[in-house]
């Protein structure tokens, strides 16, 4: 092809090429043609004769102002036609008359101000029609019943002011899963406008200034329709009362989105008419007081999003939002509750009472004063089968004994990004009989004891990154009870002392993060008592991160037991010479990172076993000695291997000898070297 299109598997991508005409030299069997972001002004039908197999044509982001009806005659198999961001202003009965197999027609962002006559009447198979971002002043798309298979009608960002049955009843035989009318200036819902549609399942009116009064009228118009999903985000619904959603009593609504409404007052029984509701989005509002009956009637809600719904009005403590006790008691089916990023004063004794199916609760950054977790804090969750609890970013400084004793079903507890500073006696976790993961990373300090985790033997993941960990070298090890542990993160703790039995018995451990500590002394031969073999027995370890520990020595047998190791990161250390057989047992190794060390020589006797099955190697920024003895074997291996070696050309540079300084390692000439073949 003389054009710079890329062709792969019957797909031609000719986008962003400044084309002024359709290429005439592409393979005739292409089924998908992308001509977006060019300078096409016309689409002459004759130019498509050779591409009769096309099922998808995308000519978005051009300057097309007119479409030849004959285009689709040349493309009898066309299913998807995308004309978004062009300059179409008028559609006639003929424009798409031959596009009878279309399932998607995208006309968004053109200049179509009015649909005259019946330009879509032949699209009997159309599923998606996108007319968003045009200048349409009405929903009138035709004068007779049509588009019987349409499922998505997208009319957002137009100038529609009223919904009228005489315009919408051309959809009398359609089942619309999505009627998208967001970002219009709708001020009127004429009687019967939604009943004119055969079946309407989803209505989206985001960014429409409805307010409480028009919302009430809307809901009355939706009575006795098939509506399931209703989205009213950012619709200036500042208050709700027990009549706002009355009309929805005669529907089976399952999803309601009231987010971004600056909703201030949620009156009692506002949602009493929605017993079928399952998904309720209330995030980004301004609720000042949740009354005990505000949520009454929501017996079937499974998902409730209250993120940033309760925010304080001023600095004054008196202006903090209030949640009455038992406010959530009606939500018998609630499984997922998001209350992130709020300004709730604290957890009251009956705050969550009645949530008998709650499995996921996010309270991240939810409270203004939750400094201490006591044995009363979560009493209202005693009868909730909670699996996941997120308590991050709450400035929690202390966890008292039995704080979680009510949460016997809990599997994941996230306490990260707080200010916890205490000795962990182990009593904090009493009752967590099913715990799977505890995330404690990014806290103030944690002092471990032999019993810190004695009561949570089921724990499989423990995250203790950057918590100024103390007493990690106590004996017996604080981790000894954690026989089921598969992930342990002890990184960023400046740990200098650990015992060789710290991880003893953790035979299921798969991921161990020890990066950014100070473990260098432990592997020195000069260490009093010899090197500390703290990795012994970890026969199922898959990932080991030892980056940034200052290591300048590696004991020869330190990785001896790590038969299943797949990834090892030793980057940003001070390693120079590695013992000959150090990687001999790493037959499963897939990724090796030794970047930014002091390695000068990459010899077969050291690296041969490690490189055998490698898929990724990172040895960037090492001061390679470009001599036959040091790197001939490595260079030959590089040039034969299929291993991915990022930035090989630019970041693998010779340091010595001087005349090779700055020279790319891979270009080192090995032809004069003896016995340097990488594979035998």
């Amino acid at each position: 092809s003389t054009t710079k299109c890329t062709v792969s598997h019957e797909v031609a991508d000719c986008s962003h090429l400044k084309l002024t005409q359709v290429p005439d030299d592409l393979p005739t069997n292409i089924t998908v043609l992308n001509l977006t972001h060019n300078q096409l002004r016309r689409l002459p039908a004759a130019n498509f004769t050779r591409y009769s197999q096309l099922t998808s044509l995308d000519v978005g982001f051009n300057t097309i102002s007119k479409l030849e009806p004959e285009l689709c005659q040349k493309l009898p198999m066309l299913k998807v036609l995308n004309l978004q961001h062009n300059e179409l202003s008028q559609l006639s009965d003929k424009t798409f008359a031959f596009c009878t197999n279309l399932t998607e027609l995208h006309l968004m962002s053109n200049s179509i101000q009015k649909i005259k006559n019946n330009p879509f009447v032949k699209q009997k198979n159309l599923i998606t029609l996108d007319l968003s971002h045009n200048g349409l002043s009405s929903t009138k798309l035709g004068t007779q019943v049509q588009l019987e298979n349409l499922q998505e009608l997208l009319l957002s960002n137009n100038k529609i002011q009223a919904l009228k049955s005489e315009e919408l009843d051309i959809f009398a035989n359609s089942s619309l899963k999505k009627l998208e009318l967001s970002s219009n200036q709708i001020k009127e819902f004429s009687p019967g406008c939604f009943h004119a549609i055969g079946r309407l399942f989803g209505l989206f009116l985001n960014n429409v200034q409805l307010g409480p009064s028009l919302t009430e009228k809307l809901c009355l118009e939706l009575a006795n329709t098939s509506i399931r999903n209703l989205s009213l985000s950012n619709s200036q619904l500042s208050t709700t009362s027990n009549t706002t959603f009355l009309g929805l009593k005669w529907t089976n609504l399952t999803m309601l989105d009231l987010s971004y409404n600056n909703l201030n007052v949620v009156g009692n029984d506002s949602f009493a008419w929605l017993p079928q509701l399952e998904y309720f989005f209330l995030e980004y509002n301004n609720i000042q007081h949740l009354f005990s009956h505000s949520l009454h009637g929501l017996f079937n809600v499974r998902y409730l999003n209250l993120k940033r719904s309760f925010t304080k009005q001023s600095i004054s403590l008196a202006s903090l939002p209030k949640i009455d006790d038992f406010s959530f008691q009606w939500l018998k089916c609630l499984e997922h509750l998001n209350m992130e990023d709020n300004d709730i004063p604290g957890i009251k004794s009956n705050m969550f009472t009645g949530l008998i199916n709650l499995k996921y609760l996010s309270l991240s950054n939810s409270f203004t004063s939750l400094r201490t977790l006591t044995n009363e804090t979560f009493v209202s969750l005693a009868h909730s089968p909670l699996h996941i609890l997120n308590l991050t970013k709450n400035k929690i400084s202390k966890i008292e004994s039995d704080a979680f004793s009510w949460l016997g079903h809990l599997e994941v507890l996230d306490l990260g990004l707080n200010e916890i500073g205490q000795e962990l006696t182990g009593q904090e976790w009493r009752g967590l009989e099913n715990i799977f993961e505890i995330y404690l990373s990014y806290n103030k300090y944690l002092q471990l004891t032999r019993n810190s985790f004695a009561l949570v033997p089921s724990l499989q993941r423990l995250m203790l990154r950057r918590v100024a960990l103390k007493n990690v070298d106590s004996s017996p090890s604080p981790f000894q009870p954690l026989r089921n542990l598969t992930i342990l993160d002890l990184s960023n703790n400046n740990i200098a002392n650990i015992n060789d039995d710290m991880l003893e018995g953790l035979e299921k451990l798969e991921i161990l993060d020890l990066q950014h500590n100070n473990l260098a002394r432990l592997w020195k031969h000069a260490n009093p008592g010899g090197p500390i073999y703290f990795l012994k027995g970890l026969s199922h370890l898959h990932i080991l991160n030892l980056e940034s520990n200052g290591f300048d020595e590696i004991p020869v047998e330190v990785f001896k037991d790590l038969f299943e190791l797949k990834i090892i990161d030793l980057g940003l250390n001070n390693l120079n010479t590695l013992p000959a057989s150090v990687f001999n047992n790493q037959v499963s190794l897939k990724s090796l990172n030794l970047q930014k060390n002091l390695i000068t020589s990459v010899e077969k006797k050291v690296f041969g076993p490690a490189f055998r099955n490698l898929t990724e190697l990172d040895m960037r920024f090492n001061p390679f000695d470009c001599t036959c003895e040091s790197i001939a074997w490595f260079v030959n291996w590089i040039n034969e291997t299929h291993t991915n070696i990022p930035e090989l050309s630019s970041h693998y540079l010779c340091n010595t000898p001087p005349h090779y300084h700055g020279f790319p390692v891979r270009l080192f000439d090995t032809s004069s070297c003896k016995d340097s073949a990488p594979f035998e």
Partner: antibody
């Protein structure tokens, strides 16, 4: 086979109301694949469209600007027919009146009534 | 609104080709229908949607439409084709717009 049978008086006095009926056989006036209308032809003159009715969720009509203030076309679903009423007639309304079936989607007339000559005279 | 203009009359010798034009601004983007009317009879649809022929209409009738002109073509014109011919289209809210009609005379 669709047939349209017209009926109605052939003589109407000025200022009175012209009323014609078009009975349909072989199709339904409530069909959503066709529309129904009236056309007239003054002696020695061309065809003039008067109006149309079509059924979607309810009945809709469109009338020619020249007669809009005086015309009504109504369906009668029980008798499967539709009618034309033209008020305040004058001698200029003397013409042969045809009822017609408009075929979707582009409103070609595939069936015509036999035509009724209506004379407006005192 | 669309306006359709036809020549008042067209003459053709038997067996020759008659062409009747119907002009209108951008008529090519509208569908045009053609009706034949013989004296004392109701009109009959001879071409619909520019070029489609209803069943029972002889093959000598054909139509085309592009730009500002639609054309009805009768090839091998016969005496029985002598009649008035009307072009028609629709443009909401006027669901029918007729041309003024053309009298076809077979010499």
């Amino acid at each position: 086979q669709v047939e349209l049978q017209q009926s109605g008086p052939g003589l109407v006095k000025p200022s009175q109301t012209l009323s014609l009926t078009c009975a349909i056989s072989g199709d339904s006036v409530s069909s959503n694949s066709a529309a129904w209308g009236w056309i007239r032809q003054s002696p020695g003159r061309g065809l003039e469209w008067l109006g149309i009715i079509q059924k979607r969720s309810k009945w809709y009509n469109n009338y020619a600007v020249s007669v809009k203030s005086r015309i009504t076309i109504n369906p009668d679903t029980s008798k499967n027919q539709f009618s034309l009423q033209l008020n305040s007639v004058t001698p200029e309304d003397t013409a042969v009146y045809y009822c017609a079936r408009y075929s979707y989607p582009f409103y070609s007339i595939d069936y015509w009534g036999q035509g009724t000559l209506v004379t407006v005279s005192s | 609104d669309i306006e359709l203009t036809q020549p008042p009359s067209v003459s053709v010798a038997p067996g020759q080709t008659a062409r009747i034009s119907c002009s209108g601004d951008n008529i090519g983007s509208y569908y045009v229908h053609w009706y034949q009317q013989k004296p004392g009879q109701a009109p009959v649809l001879v071409i619909y949607e520019d070029s489609e022929r209803p069943s029972g209409i002889p093959e000598r009738f054909s139509g085309s439409n592009s730009g500002n002109t639609a054309t009805l073509t009768i090839s091998g014109t016969q005496a029985e084709d002598e009649a008035d011919y009307y072009c028609s289209s629709y443009d909401d809210p006027n669901f029918q717009v007729f041309g003024g009609g053309t009298k076809l005379t077979v010499l």
